[in-house]
Interface confidence: medium
């Protein structure tokens, strides 16, 4: 009378039907601790970035500043939700904050992902225009076009993340003691087509939120590096150290972005490919188990950006020092104006004021005046 069992599919795929899966064992306090660290560093760092950008006078701001500010806003709005995710993970996936915050905080993760990567792409393109085509595209980089580009990227990010807002919900799926915050496809798909929806949304988010922007960034940096290398060949030997610094900063930007987001997108893509390629069970289980850590690494990016985009600039550090100085009520008017002037726009790339080589709004007009010698991250 014994019944032999047919092994069925696990959720989301109908290939490795013989695989045996168990509840994912959380890493105790490790992931929540990282989330809280990212929250603390992210709020502080991105707060400082915003403060540094917005304390400068409007005339002193450059086209890149709007992307810098947007990036900081995106990261800031996301990192403030991390205490919720830290709590959720620490409670072994029990969501106590209700459906609204489940939807909102999940939505902000993806808005941040898209907005951040679009801002980084915008910055890369801005730098490309500044270095590779400064004369021909000077007008493209006016504050107005920067504002339009930012508005477009925010609208795009908000729209691309909308499926998460719609489909996220809370429920006690087969578990009366815990409430999960999860993607519920039942309103748009039958059980048999849920996997298609998951793959569709996964592929599109990886393509639009990583592959395309990263390709654009690499292309921009390729031409930037080519242009800089060409100019440095005409420079004296003492320019070598500064050339290496600038190129290394560019490499750090691209590599950090890739290191933070590549594991997340790669593991996600490999998992989805599993339904076609039939991975061995052990590999499939490995992908399932490392995915939370890949997600964690991608979240870390939200607190690294301020360091990478701002802290490389000595003038940004001066602005921070100036703020700390003011915070301790030791701020003399002279020291404030001196450091304040220097850090008016940390992304400007100029230590000198608008001079003979400047166009409207202080834009540099002559290609041979590209400021290789400036120890700044965002070069105008």
């Amino acid at each position: 009378m014994e019944e032999g069992g047919d092994f069925d599919n696990y959720y989301g795929a109908d290939n490795q039907s013989e695989c045996e899966y168990t509840d994912w064992k959380s890493s105790g306090a490790l992931i929540p601790a990282i989330y809280m660290l990212v929250f603390l560093l992210g709020t502080t760092g991105n707060g400082l970035v915003l403060w540094t950008v917005f304390r400068s006078s409007r005339e002193k701001r450059r086209s890149a500043d709007i992307f810098i500010a947007s990036l900081a806003v995106a990261d800031l709005t996301f990192v403030v939700t991390l205490p919720l995710w830290a709590t959720y993970t620490y409670r072994d996936y029990d969501w106590p904050f209700g459906t609204f915050f489940c939807k909102l905080s999940s939505y902000l993760i993806f808005v941040n992902m898209y907005a951040s990567v679009f801002c980084l792409t915008g910055l890369s393109f801005d730098r490309y225009l500044a270095i590779v085509r400064p004369v021909a595209n000077a007008r493209l980089r006016l504050r107005v076009s920067g504002a339009v580009a930012t508005a477009v990227l925010w609208v795009l990010a908000a729209l691309l993340a909308m499926p998460v807002m719609v489909l996220r919900t809370t429920g006690d799926l087969e578990n009366t003691t815990k409430v999960q915050c999860y993607m519920d496809y039942s309103m748009v798909a039958t059980v048999s087509s849920e996997w298609a929806w998951e793959v569709g949304l996964g592929v599109s988010s990886t393509t639009v939120g990583f592959v395309v922007p990263f390709t654009i960034m690499l292309t921009c940096y390729f031409f930037i590096a080519q242009t800089i290398a060409g100019h440095f060949r005409k420079e004296r030997i003492e320019g070598l150290r500064k050339r290496r610094r600038l190129l290394s900063i560019i490499v750090v930007l691209v590599v950090t972005f890739a290191l933070c987001w590549m594991p997340y997108h790669l593991v996600k893509t490999l998992y989805m490919l599993g339904s076609l390629l039939h991975w061995p069970c052990d590999f499939d289980l490995f992908l399932m188990n490392i995915f939370p850590y890949c997600t964690c690494i991608s979240y870390v990016n939200s607190c690294l950006n301020p360091f990478l985009y701002a802290f490389f600039d000595p003038r940004f550090r001066q602005a921070c020092t100036s703020m700390l100085c003011c915070g301790q009520s030791r701020c003399a008017g002279t020291s404030h104006s001196s450091s304040g002037e220097k850090s008016a726009s940390y992304s400007s790339g100029h230590s000198q004021g608008p001079g003979p080589n400047m166009g409207k709004g202080g834009e540099q007009m002559h290609e041979k005046s590209i400021p290789y010698s400036q120890e700044t991250l965002v070069v105008d």
Epitope: Y21, D23, L173, E174, Q180
Partner: antibody, heavy 129, light 107 residues
């Protein structure tokens, strides 16, 4: 071959106790939730209890709460049902079954129930004076 | 507890007939429902999970549909081995509850 074999059934007086066992073979026992389901003579199926892989979660039907205890011995690939204060209405064939869950890749902590995919042949418990 | 009401409680049909069994939940259970077949003296066998997903190895003549409170199991082209008792099981909340069963007999 995937198999579940129940034992421990028999005749017991009302108020008495009995311990049912279920030995699993052909699959990794400690990877699965397990359930007990019973069927009174000539009646339908009634879910009794289930237990998580590590024993940290256990659920019971109201009629057996406080009287029955589900447990597992992973070293022996065994599932148990300790039955106390037995009543005439507990007379039934008791099946042990393997619960099948799916797990969300994206949303950790979320699991989807796929039903009981492997059943034992059943063991008969008769409560009578 | 969620009550599951199956109808009809029994039916007579001939080989080749199309048979439909309905299961109604006392409250919404999304698609958290499975269908089981039990032949006399045997253990139950899972046919359908998640309301409409066919268990591996189960013939395609069996199909499930429905969501919320109303669910159906359809056997299109009844075969001699299909004469058995069919149960629905809700697993939306604990305790899990079965329908009272539908006995499919030979006419």
């Amino acid at each position: 071959e995937v198999q579940l074999v129940e034992s421990g059934g028999g005749l017991v007086q009302p108020g008495g106790s009995l311990r049912l066992s279920c030995v699993a073979s052909g699959f990794t026992f400690n990877n699965y939730w397990m359930s007990w389901v019973r069927q009174a003579p000539g009646k339908g199926l009634e879910w009794v209890a289930n237990i998580k892989q590590d024993g940290s979660e256990r659920y019971y039907v109201d009629s057996v709460k406080g009287r029955f205890t589900i447990s597992r011995g992973d070293a022996k690939n065994s599932l148990y049902l300790q039955m106390k204060s037995l009543r005439a209405e507990d007379t039934a064939v008791y099946f042990c079954a393997r619960d099948r869950f799916g797990y969300s890749f994206y949303d950790k902590g979320v699991r989807y129930y796929y039903g009981m995919d492997v059943w034992g042949q059943g063991t008969t418990v008769t409560v009578s004076s | 507890d969620i009550q599951m009401t199956q109808s009809p409680s029994s039916l007579s049909a001939s080989v080749g007939d199309r048979v439909t069994i309905t299961c109604r939940a006392s409250q919404g259970i999304r698609n958290d429902l499975g269908w089981y077949q039990q032949r006399p003296g045997k253990a139950p066998k899972r046919l359908i999970y998640a309301a409409s997903s066919l268990q591996t190895g189960v013939p395609s003549r069996f199909s499930g549909s429905g969501s919320g409170t109303e669910f159906t199991l359809t056997i299109s082209g009844l075969q001699p081995e299909d004469f058995a008792t069919y149960y629905c099981l809700q697993h939306n909340s604990y305790p899990r509850t079965f329908g009272q069963g539908t006995k499919v007999e030979i006419r």
